[in-house]
């Protein structure tokens, strides 16, 4: 009776187990009762990094110099190209799809150390009593407003992203 599951590096098609194509190769035709799976190597600037049944290889990533990118590691038929940023610039993500001179600190974080030519911005979370409501590459966390010194009371508590809201004291008549 036909198989319902296949071994590792095989796939089920037409009630038959066929070999997957090895990394660096794409599927041309499925196996039959009489023939093996037919695979072809990926072309120049293409790759497949897993055992697969893909009919098309993936294009290597392009490291766009207009975005500040350059090739860190050239792709092969089995691996994608790895991009990095020009010296002194920083990737915006692990995938390194674009470059920034230095990162900024999001709301809720303040700048602990401003970026230099050799180090990126260092951010720190705003502790209790401090806040930052902006993205910045130079601003520290700011202390909450002291309502008491203005003879006011706290109407709304502060957070790491918002200042306290002060209001008038309730006067007893």
């Amino acid at each position: 009776e036909p198989p319902t599951a296949c071994r590792e590096k095989q796939y089920l098609i037409n009630s038959q187990c066929c070999s997957l194509c090895q990394p660096g190769q794409k599927l041309v035709s499925d196996c039959t009762e009489f023939t093996e799976t037919e695979c072809l190597p990926c072309g120049e600037s293409e790759f497949l990094d897993t055992w697969n049944r893909e009919t098309h290889c993936h294009q290597h990533k392009y490291c766009d110099p207009n975005l500040g990118l350059r090739v860190q590691q050239k792709g092969t038929s089995e691996t994608d190209t790895i991009c990095t940023c020009e010296e002194g610039w920083h990737c915006t993500s692990e995938a390194c799809e674009s470059c920034v001179l230095h990162r900024s600190c999001s709301p809720g974080f303040g700048v602990k150390q401003i970026a230099t030519g050799v180090s990126d911005t260092i951010c720190e979370p705003c502790p209790v009593g401090f806040f930052s409501n902006v993205s910045s590459a130079f601003e520290k966390c700011h202390p909450w407003t002291s309502c008491e010194t203005k003879d006011l009371v706290v109407q709304q508590a502060g957070t790491n992203k918002t200042d306290v809201v002060c209001g008038p004291q309730d006067r007893l008549r």
């Epitope: 500040g68 915006t92 470059c99 910045s136």
Partner: nanobody, 116 residues
């Protein structure tokens, strides 16, 4: 498309002054922190000065503190850098930049040469 056009550079004698301008377009200028960054010949990029969106808070590198003043006019979408008491070591190409400093959003810069 973000565009930043720096101007105002030139040749000036030590002790002299210059005012750089940066005309911004393609984004809501008043919403962004802005920076002046410079690159001296054969050197890396140096962060010179920054200003928050409202123009109420500023940052200056130690090397320019007390000599340079950053300002902005949000109604004119323009950033400024007033440079006084210029020194030979201020010679550089000056760029303005907006958060978050994407490589693709930089202008051509303006060259400042301080020499007698």
């Amino acid at each position: 498309e973000v565009q930043l056009l720096e101007s105002g550079g030139g040749l000036v004698q030590p002790g002299g002054s210059l005012r750089l301008s940066c005309a911004a377009s393609g984004f809501t200028f008043r919403d962004y922190e802005m920076w002046w960054v410079r690159q001296a010949p054969g050197k890396g990029l140096e962060r010179v000065s920054a200003i928050n969106p409202q123009g109420t808070r500023t940052y200056y590198a130690d090397s320019v503190k007390g000599r340079f003043t950053i300002s902005r006019d949000n109604s004119k979408n323009t950033l400024y850098l007033q440079m006084n008491s210029l020194r030979a070591e201020d010679t550089a190409v000056y760029y303005c930049a907006k958060l978050p400093f994407y490589f693709s959003e930089w202008g051509q810069g303006t060259l400042v040469t301080v020499s007698s």
